[in-house]
Each structure stands twice: as C-alpha cells, then as structure tokens.
Amino acid sequence: TSSASSSSSSAPFLASAASAQPPLPDQCPALCECSEAARTVKCVNRNLTEVPTDLPLYVRNLFLTGNQLAVLPAGAFARRPPLAELAALNLSGSRLDEVRGGAFEHLPSLRQLDLSHNPLAYLSPFAFSGSNASISAPSPLVELILNHIVPPDDKRQNRSFEGMVAAALVAGRALQGLHLLELASNHFLYLPRDVLAQLPSLRYLDLSNNSLVSLTYVSFRNLTHLESLHLEDNALKVLHNGTLAELQGLPHVRVFLDNNPWVCDCHMADMVTWLKQTGVVQGKDRLTCAFPEKMRNRVLLELNSADLDCDPILPPSLQTS
C-alpha cells in the first residue's frame, strides 16, 4: 500500500532523471495507507482526532477505526467534488461520543456504515436522514452496524438510550432501503414501538446480547423480507401468541433464541407447542429453561403441558407476610 510517507523515484527509462520525487503526488492522507486498485483507504489506530480532509476521490472503502474522533460534525465527509464512490465506511472503535445531524451527508453511494464500539452519548435524530423534514431523501444505506454503541452510565443523556437510537433510525423514513441492522450489545431493555415498521426492507436484524425482557409491544408484521432475527443472549422469559404468529407469518425468517432465561411455567405452553411444530427457530433443541428452579436446564422441546404449571396465587386474605 502507498502512504503519505512513502516515496519512489522518477521513471527508470530516463537516464537523466534528477528528481527522487514521484512525478504525481500520492493523494494518500498522512497517517493513512491507500490502495488505488482496492479503492481502499485505511487510517487505522493512528489516534486521529478528525476525518482527513484530503481523502482521494477514488475511495470506496474507508477504514477510520481505532482513532479518537470524539465528534462527527455535520458534513464530516462532504467534499468538493463529493466522495461519490464511497460505499463502505468503518468508524468502529474511534471513541466517538457524538454524531451530529447530517454527519454522513453528500455520500451518495454509502451502502455500509459501521459505528460499532463507540460510546455514543449523543446520536442526532438526523444522523442518518440528514434533515429534519418529516420525509427526507432516501438514504443509500443498506447495512448499518451499531453494535456496542451504548455509553457508560455516567455519560448517558436523560432520555432513554433506546429512544435516542430509535429516533435516528426512523427520522424522515430515510432508512426504508436498509437490509441489515446490527444493534447487538447495547443494554437495550426494550425495542421502541414502531421502529421496525419504518424499516420494511430489513433482511437481517441482530438484537443479540441486549437485555430485552419482552417482545410484547414489538411488531414484526411488516418485515416480510426478514431472513435472520438474532435474539440470543437477552433476558427473554417467554414469547407470547401474538409474537409467535407474527414470526410464523414471515416467509423466509430464521430466528435465533439461544441463551435466554426462559421461564417454564403455564405461560410457556403456547411457545412450547409452537416450537415443536415450527421450522423458524434455529437450534431450537438447545433452548432450555432457566426458571423456576425445579425446571432449570430442562429442554423446552421435551416439555409437555403437565410440566408447565403456575403456582396458584393465593387470595389476599390468605396471604401471609
């Protein structure tokens, strides 16, 4: 790869060549490595505090990982002429704590964006839509990777983190063309209502390693193209009939439910019945009960209705303290 620090001499066929400089400037930013043939620029682990201004126009793949960018302002990648070919942008692990509205404007070919492993205390509602219009121009994004973007507790804003992320995903209906969304490892307690309704093209949704307790208020009905739904490593206790019916109604979906603390009581009966007949759940034979204690490690597929009871709730007059 070429870099700003590399040098090469002038053409070998001129015996009188006096200059040791290359005939054309390198067009690779300082602290970066560039490959014209791969159309790739890598500025990785260089403690950059801002996006290089002199990015080459040919860049399709830009890696800005492992830096110290802190803030991504509006128009952070806007150039004249624009970076018209930039298709994949990886900003993971660059200590971003603020992504402002319009940060990714003027990138007409941007299909994949990775903001993972940045403690985003502030994600503007207009980070991806670029404007505050009720319906904005469609974003070209097809893949949006937002794994582990939750900030530490002391850096959180007053509003819910889930709400902040949801607002950015639905603003202006800009992400209607999104096929892949990764939201793993974000301590989500819930998925805000109506988010998925605004993402009708989703094929892959990763919500693994969060703290989701219930999907009761989440609707998957619109996600007719969904192929993979990752819900592993959450805090799910049971899936209720409405959710089961919606998942069963999706024509291509595969659902991943491993490592959830399933509560195997009377409320689990419908889910067990569904699991036994569905082809939707991958690795369904690995799903085991976590509660109550007497059911711990029992395989869900091996349960029958007699196993799934609820302790009777005593009338108040008979309860003792």
């Epitope: 290359p22 054309l24 014209e36 791969a38 159309r39 040919y58």
Partner: antibody
Framework: EVQLQQSGPVLVKPGASVKMSCEAS????????MSWVKQSRGRSLEWIGV????????IYNQKFKGKATLTVDKSSSTAYMELSSLTSEDSGVYSC????????????WGQGTSVAVSS | ENVLTQSPAIMSASPGEKVTMTCRAT???????FHWYQQKSGASPKVWIY???NLASGVPARFSGSGSGTSFSLTISSVEAEDVATYFC?????????FGGGTKLEIK
Amino acid sequence: EVQLQQSGPVLVKPGASVKMSCEASGYSFIDYYMSWVKQSRGRSLEWIGVFNPYSGEIIYNQKFKGKATLTVDKSSSTAYMELSSLTSEDSGVYSCARLRISYYAIDYWGQGTSVAVSS
Amino acid sequence: ENVLTQSPAIMSASPGEKVTMTCRATSSVSSGHFHWYQQKSGASPKVWIYSTSNLASGVPARFSGSGSGTSFSLTISSVEAEDVATYFCQQYSGYPLTFGGGTKLEIK
C-alpha cells in the same frame, strides 16, 4: 524506485501471436492499475486496456478486444499482454504503464517492447 | 469515445519565445482528468502537466497549463533547447482513455 521492466523486441510473421511481459518493482504491485499503450511509428498513443491486479477486473478499449489479452502473475509482480492474429498494422512499440486512478493519468512507463510483423 | 485533436501538429520556435499549443476534445472533460505528457526522441513519455494546470515533479516553471470543458492549452513562457519534444494531451471521461495526436516542438 519504481521500475517497469519489459521483455525484448520481437519479429514475428503475420498470423502469429506474441506474449510480452512487464515486471514491476519498487512498489506494491497489487495496489495500482496497470495499463498498456501502443505507439505506432510516427503515430500517436493508443490506450489498449487496463488490469486491476487486486480484483482481476480487466477493461479493454473496444478497438483492441479480441486482439489483446491482459493477464498478471501477482506472485512475481508481472503483467503480460498477448497479441494474436498479428498483421502489419499491429507493428509498433507496446508499453506497460502504471495508471493512477487518483487522476486517471500515467505516472510510470515501461521502456516498451517493439513488435515488428513481417513476412 | 472522446477524441482529442491537437494543434498545431508541428511548431517551430526560437529560444526565449513564448509558445502555446492546444488540445480540443469532442466532449467535455473534467479538469482533474486532463493531462499533458512530454516525449523526447527514443524515450517513453513522461507526465508533464496533470489535472489541467499542475506541473509534475521536476517540470520547469516556464511551463503552464490551462483550459476547461473541451478546450485546453499548454504554454511555455520562454522556450529553451531542452524543450524539444512531442507533447501529447490525454483525457479520461470514462473508458477508453484517449490521447491527442501530439504537437512536435522544434527549435529554430
């Protein structure tokens, strides 16, 4: 020091084929496009095509499709061009040249391989 | 394809004289993708002016380039004997890259 070292001159009969080489050194071969250019005696330069050694993509000038075949051997940082069904019109000097897509300009040229087609 | 026509085909100048050669394209070219090369007898071409007006490394300051759209020019403010060469223009507005027919500069 960037160098593009080409194979020696050839004299061939009409209808024959010839394969010439261009060995690159002094830079990362896989990171830059390699073009080929023809210069006929007393005539201008004609762009034959370009090879992307990273992706394997080849783009030919329509005029040279079926006449020229571009290949590379990444392990030896060498580009090749084969010319087929040669006629006297194909006589000339053929140069490999590194194409900089930052500008779509050529920054380094080989010394050229002279091809003479004669019966 | 975008055809480039250079004029004059041959020009002769005295040392110290100012000379200008032109290159016209059949369709518009981005200024960043228009270039000039110098080729001396028996040698390979060298990129001489890139992106319309920028001098390549080692090119004397008496050379300059200008133009936009379909009309471009190369000027030598004060010709010297070492400038004897053929100058080719080249453009990219999508493949194929094309070259002009060349302007041969001679010294009187």
